[in-house]
Structures are given as structure tokens and as C-alpha cells.
């Protein structure tokens, strides 16, 4: 019987470092090895018939035990499939190796209204583009961490908001007077130093009533 396997199905490596993606196989007399890269809608062939393809040949080397990168970039993050077949035969096996290229978060950008109307919906956003894996976000009001559920802490029990740590969106609905304050957010992805945005003050103002 044929086997195709990797003892490292997930590899995490800091950007600009070398890395090897392992693929061990047995039971093939004349193995033909191919490596495919998948990331979202993108699919690329890295290795075809035991040879690295032109788009990778300057930085990837084929070895009988896997493929080795001289230096990885964030664009290399994705799933690599090692596919082994018998030349001229019908034996086939494959194994997937997930590569996560680690990049620390950059300073997050916030979108916070300087004033918002009490009783209305107010949307605050926080995002950063560099972090790999993608960052999770924590919001602060006046330097205090905002819990995901406002009712869980006395300090925020009068607030009504929904906080999404994955998207970085903070939605007040409805906004109350006590939501006035200085807001900032922190991005962290478990690699490198967490980064904090600038703090921006939001005033919760009464609705203008026409005379």
C-alpha cells in the first residue's frame, strides 16, 4: 500500500525565515511529486513532476523529503498539497500542509465619530492589515477594557453594544449618554507585540429638537 504523509501538518514561521514543508511517501517505485498552493481563490502549482515551477524556482527547492523555501513572505500563507503518483501507474496519495507565515500586527486604524446622537446607532471600527494570522481586536473606553458582553461588568452595564473581536467592529444600539468617552483599540495575533490605535473622543449628544 502507498502512504503520503507529513509529520508537520501545520507550520508557523516568522516572515523572511526559511522553512521546509515535509512530505514523506512510501510504496512508490517511480514517484512523481507535485505540490499545489491554495489560498482563497488562488491556486498555483509550486512543483510539477519533481521540478519546481518557473514562478517559484528562484526561492523554492525540491527535495525528496519535501520543498524548502529560502525565505517566506506573508503571501506564502496558505495550504500546500503534496500529491504523489506512480509514473505510468494508478497509485496516488496526497497530504495537505498548512503554512502560516507570522507577521506582527501594525498599528490599527480607527474610525470613530467625534459625536453621535443618543438613542441612535453608532458604529466604531478598528482594523489593521499586516497581522498574520489575522488580528483579534480589543476595545478600550477611557483606558478600560470593554468586555464582549457589556452586562458582564458593572462599569458597562448601562451600555448597549455589540463588539466583534474578529472584525473589530463596535456597534452601540442605542447609544446612551454614558457612552461618551475616549475610545481606542488594540490588535493582537499572538505573534509580536500587540499594537494600540490612537485614542479618539466620542461625545454622545442629545438629539436636536426643532423649535
Amino acid at each position: 500500500s502507498v502512504t503520503v504523509h507529513s509529520s508537520e501538518p501545520e507550520v508557523r514561521i516568522p516572515e523572511n525565515n526559511p522553512v521546509k514543508l515535509s512530505c514523506a511517501y512510501s510504496g512508490f517505485s517511480s514517484p512523481r511529486v507535485e505540490w499545489k498552493f491554495d489560498q482563497g481563490d488562488t491556486t498555483r502549482l509550486v512543483c510539477y513532476n519533481n521540478k519546481i515551477t518557473a514562478s517559484y524556482e528562484d526561492r523554492v527547492t525540491f527535495l525528496p523529503t519535501g520543498i524548502t523555501f529560502k525565505s517566506v513572505t506573508r503571501e506564502d500563507t496558505g495550504t500546500y498539497t503534496c500529491m504523489v503518483s506512480e509514473e505510468g501507474g494508478n497509485s496516488y496519495g496526497e497530504v495537505k500542509v498548512k503554512l502560516i507565515v507570522l507577521v506582527p500586527p501594525s498599528k490599527p486604524t480607527v474610525n470613530i465619530p467625534s459625536s453621535a446622537t443618543i438613542g441612535n446607532r453608532a458604529v466604531l471600527t478598528c482594523s489593521e492589515q499586516d497581522g498574520s494570522p489575522p488580528s483579534e481586536y480589543t476595545w478600550f473606553k477611557d483606558g478600560i477594557v470593554m468586555p464582549t458582553n457589556p452586562k458582564s461588568t458593572r462599569a458597562f452595564s448601562n451600555s448597549s453594544y455589540v463588539l466583534n473581536p474578529t472584525t473589530g467592529e463596535l456597534v452601540f444600539d442605542p447609544l446612551s449618554a454614558s457612552d461618551t468617552g475616549e475610545y481606542s483599540c488594540e490588535a493582537r495575533n499572538g505573534y509580536g507585540t500587540p499594537m494600540t490605535s490612537n485614542a479618539v473622543r466620542m461625545e454622545a449628544v442629545e438629539r436636536n429638537v426643532g423649535v
Partner: antibody, heavy 116, light 106 residues
Framework: QVQLVQSGAEVKKPGASVKVSCKAS????????MHWVRQAPGQRLEWMGY????????RYSQKFQGRVTITADTSTSTAYMELSSLRSEDTAVYYC?????????WGQGTLVTVSS | AIRMTQSPFSLSASVGDRVTITCKAS??????IAWYQQKPAKAPKLFIH???TLQSGVPSRFSGSGSGTDYTLTISSLQPEDFATYYC????????FGQGTKVEIK
């Protein structure tokens, strides 16, 4: 035939560092990752980390991260394992082992004794 | 991390006995287990890989079996040269050894 020959026994004081070598022959050194495994007296074998000699890429066990450094010299087909901030619990036999998927060939082992 | 629990810790047997050593993984390891023999002051020696594939030169009295989380090394008829310590290794996801089984003369 494949051979892995390690350096001789070492006696070190707590806080010091030790560097053990492993010279490979009988195969293409850059084709296979080289791992280090240790065995403290009466204990199970414990995986420490490895190096891909082709590009110098390393991976370490979380337990040893920050204290172990594995390097390779392709010109002499030699892998090295350096362990720093030694303590008495680091007294063990240290092995290098070639990886196919499992470990198929091992060095003879190097006894490192940490004693004040 | 995958944990490997090997049993028994030690066993006493006589020449000609049938000996069984087991290894239990903390999760399914998809048959990616190897067995090593180690004699005093020597390096471990690969005996079996991928559950049941005998390494070249290993006597046929050694066999391996199992699936999922439970695996077994069997020596059908113990010989004098088989007295040693045996270790299992899972290599499905990184590498973890069992604690070893010492096979002693009764």
C-alpha cells in the same frame, strides 16, 4: 551506509552552555532534517527540535524554546545542538537522529552531565 | 500535543514467551507509529514503522498492529537478544515517545 557520529561526553557546571556535534555520512546531508532527542536517566526519550540543513530552518519543542539552538554546517555535513543555562535536570544522553518521517538513523549519543 | 501512554512499564518473561506491549495515543494517529528497541548504553534502533512495516533486518517474530489510538508490538517467541527496552513513537503530528517498556528475564 548511513552513519551519524557524535562528539564525546561533556561535564558542565549549572548555568553554562554545551554544544554537541553530529557528523553525518553515507547520504546527502541536505536532503533530510536532522533532529535532536534527549534521554534523562530513567526517563522517556524527549524530542527537542530539528534543523533543515538545506536552508537552516529550525523548529524547537516549546519546552526548550529559548534555550536550545540547532545549527548545521553543510560543508562538513555536521549538525550542532547548543543548550544554554544548564541545570542539573539537563543531565542526559543527547542523540541526533535523521528524519524520513519517523527517525530511521541515530547517532551513538553524547552524555552531558551537569554538576556543580 | 499528542501524548503516548505505553504499558506495561516493565515485564518479566522467559525465552519462548509471547510478549505484548501497548501504546495508547491521546488522539487518532492514523497508524503513524514506530517502535524502537534500545539496549543499555546504545542508541534506539528502528524496528517497525507505519504500525506494522518491519524495518529491514528485523526478525519476523516482531509484529505491529493497531489503529486509531491503540497500537501493539508483539514478540511471538522471545529470544535472548530481545531483552531490552522498547519505545513507541507517534509521528502523525510532530513527534512524541511513549515512556518505554523494559523486557527483563524472568
Amino acid at each position: 551506509q548511513v552513519q551519524l557520529v557524535q562528539s564525546g561526553a561533556e561535564v558542565k557546571k549549572p548555568g553554562a552552555s554545551v554544544k554537541v556535534s553530529c557528523k553525518a555520512s553515507g547520504y546527502s546531508f541536505t536532503d533530510y532534517s536532522m533532529h535532536w532527542v534527549r534521554q534523562a536517566p530513567g526517563q522517556r526519550l524527549e524530542w527537542m527540535g530539528y534543523i533543515d540543513p538545506y536552508n537552516g530552518g529550525t523548529r524547537y519543542s516549546q519546552k526548550f524554546q529559548g534555550r536550545v539552538t540547532i545549527t548545521a554546517d553543510t560543508s562538513t555535513s555536521t549538525a550542532y545542538m547548543e543548550l544554554s543555562s544548564l541545570r542539573s535536570e539537563d543531565t542526559a544522553v543527547y542523540y541526533c537522529a535523521r528524519q524520513t518521517d519517523y527517525f530511521d538513523y541515530w547517532g551513538q549519543g553524547t552524555l552531558v552531565t551537569v554538576s556543580s | 500535543a499528542i501524548r503516548m501512554t505505553q504499558s506495561p512499564f516493565s515485564l518479566s518473561a522467559s525465552v519462548g514467551d509471547r510478549v505484548t506491549i501497548t501504546c495508547k495515543a491521546s488522539q487518532d494517529i492514523n497508524n503513524y507509529i514506530a517502535w524502537y528497541q534500545q539496549k543499555p548504553a546504545k542508541a534506539p534502533k528502528l524496528f517497525i514503522h507505519y504500525t506494522s512495516t518491519l524495518q529491514s533486518g528485523v526478525p519476523s517474530r516482531f509484529s505491529g498492529s493497531g489503529s486509531g489510538t491503540d497500537y501493539t508490538l508483539t514478540i511471538s517467541s522471545l529470544q535472548p537478544e530481545d531483552f531490552a527496552t522498547y519505545y513507541c513513537l507517534q509521528y502523525d503530528n510532530l513527534w512524541t515517545f511513549g515512556q518505554g517498556t523494559k523486557v527483563e528475564i524472568k
